[in-house]
Interface confidence: medium
């Protein structure tokens, strides 16, 4: 199943204290699914969508080995026929640098 | 198919009030953010405001807060812009669009561009 | 608010011609950006989303580049049907802003 999209939202962090806010989406006709943001390969949380929207919002505190840096990277699951659960492609990847480039 | 059909040109006096309509059709409703985007005669696109039907959530652009209310009912899968006291510099063409959206927090995100749009309506104020 | 400034406001093209029309943001928008295209009386059409994916269905001639404040739409050999007005949208931040507008006329 496709890829979901994935983008880093305002505010955007200027130090590695600053949270981090991830938005993954995935298509239209996958609401309610499950999603992982994963960091470095390694899972960072799990979220659920609420089964009216299509995406979650990832909160990643600041100052901790789990927040700032990357490469991030979302996924999410839905139940498929016989009700297995069906994991989509990972997204593209989103980097975070401090401070956040002006270019 | 993906369909996004707005109610019928409106002819209005200054002072008086309006509500248009945006009706999609060929996909969810709720999984997707309507805009509103006014363009006045011979002139450029403005970005009025946003609402996710799903759970009514709104930002408006500072130029059109207060001076619009945008509203949906998802039961009818429609969404709404309206006016209590129109102006003649109201006068325009408004589209409604779709667009990826995500709740998140206390504030919203848009992910993308506009992919459809409707036909638009055009509201003339004249005394 | 962001502002969005185009260039140029117009221009004149023949068929076959390659066109690059620029946008520049007042401040970072990442590459959240798209390009629509609009003719007279009808409503605008996405072309490029997240500044360089091509919308569905829409001719490869069209190419979208940049991140961060400057970004380019090119169209490789401009056709026909081209001849439009091309406005520039971020979308990175509330209230989402256009450009001004480009209008691509026949030479």
């Known amino acids: 199943i496709p890829a979901p999209s994935i983008r880093l939202v305002p505010p955007y962090p200027s130090s590695q204290e600053d949270p981090i806010h991830i938005a993954c989406m995935a298509p239209g006709n996958f609401p309610g699914a499950n999603f992982t943001l994963y960091r470095g390969g390694q899972v960072v949380q799990l979220l659920q969508a609420p089964t009216d929207q299509r995406g979650v919002t990832f909160n990643l505190s600041g100052g901790s080995s789990k927040a700032p840096g990357g490469p991030f990277h979302c996924q999410y699951g839905v139940l498929g026929e016989l009700n297995q659960s069906q994991l989509s492609d990972l997204s593209e990847p989103v980097n975070v640098s401090f401070p956040v480039p002006t270019w | 198919e993906v369909q996004l059909v707005q109610s019928g040109a409106e002819v209005k006096k200054p002072g008086e009030s309006l509500k248009i309509s945006c009706k999609g059709s060929?996909?969810?409703?709720?999984?997707?953010?309507i805009h509103w985007v006014r363009q006045m005669p011979g002139k450029g696109l403005e970005w009025m405001g946003i609402?996710?039907?799903?759970?009514?959530?709104?930002r408006y652009s500072p130029s059109f807060q207060g001076q619009v209310t945008i509203s949906a009912d998802k039961s009818i899968s429609t969404a709404y812009l309206q006016w209590s006291s129109l102006k003649a510099s109201d006068t325009a063409m408004y589209y409604c669009?779709?667009?990826?959206?995500?709740?998140?927090?206390?504030?919203?995100?848009?992910?993308?561009?506009?992919?459809?749009w409707g036909q638009g309506t055009l509201v003339t104020v004249s005394s | 608010d962001i502002q969005m400034t185009q260039s140029p406001s117009s221009l004149s093209a023949s068929v076959g011609d390659r066109v690059t029309i620029t946008c520049r943001a007042s401040q970072t928008i990442w590459n959240y950006l798209a390009w629509y295209q609009q003719k007279p009386g009808k409503a605008p059409k996405l072309l490029i989303y997240?500044?360089?994916n091509l919308q569905s269905g829409v001719p490869s001639r069209f190419s979208g580049s940049g991140s961060g404040t400057d970004f380019t739409l090119t169209i490789s050999s401009l056709q026909p049907e081209d001849f439009a007005t091309y406005y520039c949208?971020?979308?990175?931040?509330?209230?989402?802003?256009f450009g001004q507008g480009t209008k691509v006329e026949i030479k």
């Open positions: 949208q971020q979308y990175s931040h509330f209230p989402h802003t």
């Open positions: 060929g996909y969810s409703f709720t999984n997707y953010w």
């Open positions: 609402i996710d039907p799903g759970n009514s959530f709104t």
């Open positions: 997240d500044a360089s």
């Open positions: 669009a779709r667009g990826d959206g995500l709740y998140g927090g206390s504030d919203g995100y848009s992910m993308g561009g506009f992919d459809n």
